[in-house]
Interface confidence: low
């Protein structure tokens, strides 16, 4: 079950819940946003204060890391399995250092299996964080510091830090280095969403959340 099912079962308070995949006993703890946009959102990524190191290995990005109440990555394997069971939407919520907020909403999101390097698939962008997708389309394979699957002769994950669906290297990286205010500009390896804030701007906060399309 995901946060949408948790919501439908009567739990309508934000917080950390234990989720499971259908036909599986494997459990994962995730933060559920039960208030935003009707609730039922499973948070798959959050950056807010730089307290967690996101320059992690392939295995760590596969199983997840961090603290579901704070900064964390839910895990590519869980998200891949979840998003291949039914159709999901992805909402990416962004905050800059000047108090502005924006979002990008994709009407269809899923990750391929590990054998296909958790390639990201996205369709139907709307929202306020840019008319053009800051996650390159068509989607790319996931890369980490120890798994170079990008399209660059460089190693994007080592150069820009963090695991992400790098292109060469592409217009986004929400898992980049966390830079505090007044140190957040001219940072090529920061938390980037190009079509909202441009090239060198590193964001204050990000949240990636998913929910079944038929919620």
């Amino acid at each position: 079950r995901d946060c949408a099912e948790v919501f439908k079962s009567g739990h309508t308070t934000n917080g950390v819940y234990t989720l499971t995949l259908p036909n599986s006993t494997e459990e994962v703890k995730a933060y559920c946003d039960m208030e935003a946009g009707g609730g039922g959102w499973t948070i798959i990524q959050r950056r807010e204060d730089g307290s967690v190191d996101f320059q992690r290995t392939w295995k760590e990005y596969k199983v997840g890391f961090g603290n579901p109440s704070g900064e964390y990555w839910l895990g590519n394997e869980f998200v891949s399995q979840l998003t291949n069971q039914q159709r999901y939407v992805l909402k990416i919520h962004l905050k800059d250092w000047e108090g502005n907020e924006a979002y990008s909403l994709y009407e269809h999101f899923y990750l391929s299996s590990e054998e296909l390097n958790y390639r990201i698939h996205l369709k139907g962008l709307t929202g306020t964080a840019g008319k053009i997708s800051s996650i390159s389309q068509p989607g790319n394979d996931f890369s980490t510091k120890d798994a170079d699957n990008d399209k660059c002769i460089c190693k994007c994950s080592q150069m820009l830090t963090g695991g992400w669906w790098f292109d060469a290297c592409g217009p986004s990286n929400l898992n980049g280095m966390y830079y505090p205010q007044r140190q957040n500009t001219n940072k090529f390896n920061g938390i980037k969403w190009y079509y909202w804030k441009g090239s060198g701007y590193s964001l204050k906060g990000t949240t990636m959340m998913i929910r079944p399309a038929d919620f």
């Epitope: 390159s136 460089c154 592409g170 090529f188 190009y194 441009g198 090239s199 060198g200």
Partner: antibody
Framework: EVQLVESGGDLVQPGGSLRLSCTAS????????MTWVRQAPGRGLEWVAN????????YFLDSVKGRFTISRDNAKDLLFLQMNSLRGEDTAVYYC??????????????WGQGTLVTVSS | DIQMTQSPSTLSASVGDRVTVTCRAS??????LAWYQQKPGKAPKLLIS???SLESGVPSRFSGSGSGTEFTLTISSLQPDDFATYYC????????FGQGTMVEIK
């Protein structure tokens, strides 16, 4: 030596179509974003459209969206701009330009000599 | 969209003069700014990128400065070959040029 050579400019009537080509040499064409920039007679420079290395992302100036298409042939080191429903305000010298950026946007480091498109009845 | 405003539009100067062209962005572009030189009938030439990085082969009399929304191109001692039109361009978010500054002989 990097070279960009445009061709295809002509006199065309309003509502007509034209296809511009750009032949690139002296660099690995498939590794760079490519751009079209135009300059109306006696006026300034205006970015028109650009295309990612593999051709999978294309961006356009609002006023040409739906009328212009950009494409490339990496096997032949060619860049194209297909211009339909041409208007008088599209009259300009069109430059083929290389974008140096390793991200989405960079400065334009090499320019062709330009090809003149005149839209007039 | 980000607008770029250059001033002055025309600048009359003599050989040896120190010349300054300014460029203002409608919102912050950090330092993602380029300067180009264009001579009549020719394509523009990239002089400076990232606000202050001089391109290879460009004479050291050219320099760029600024960040955020205010930028400056300076020619320390104007030479006969420098009479041309100069454009700033932001590449922080899409690509937009200033309207140009013509440097002419006084």
């Amino acid at each position: 030596e990097v070279q960009l050579v445009e061709s295809g400019g002509d006199l065309v009537q309003p509502g007509g179509s034209l296809r511009l080509s750009c032949t690139a040499s002296g660099f690995t064409f498939s590794k760079y974003w490519m751009t079209w920039v135009r300059q109306a007679p006696g006026r300034g420079l205006e970015w028109v459209a650009n295309i990612k290395e593999d051709g999978n992302e294309k961006y356009f100036l609002d006023s040409v969206k739906g009328r212009f298409t950009i494409s490339r042939d990496n096997a032949k080191d060619l860049l194209f701009l297909q211009m339909n429903s041409l208007r008088g305000e599209d009259t300009a010298v069109y430059y083929c330009v290389r974008d140096r950026g390793i991200e989405v946007a960079g400065p334009f480091d090499y320019w062709g000599q330009g090809t003149l498109v005149t839209v007039s009845s | 969209d980000i607008q770029m405003t250059q001033s002055p539009s025309t600048l009359s100067a003599s050989v040896g003069d120190r010349v300054t062209v300014t460029c203002r962005a409608s919102q912050t572009i950090i330092n993602w700014l380029a300067w180009y030189q264009q001579k009549p009938g020719k394509a523009p030439k990239l002089l400076i990128s990232k606000a202050s990085s001089l391109e290879s082969g460009v004479p050291s009399r050219f320099s760029g400065s600024g960040s955020g929304t205010e930028f400056t191109l300076t020619i320390s001692s104007l030479q006969p070959d420098d009479f041309a039109t100069y454009y700033c361009q932001q590449y922080n978010r899409y690509w937009t040029f200033g309207q140009g500054t013509m440097v002419e002989i006084k």
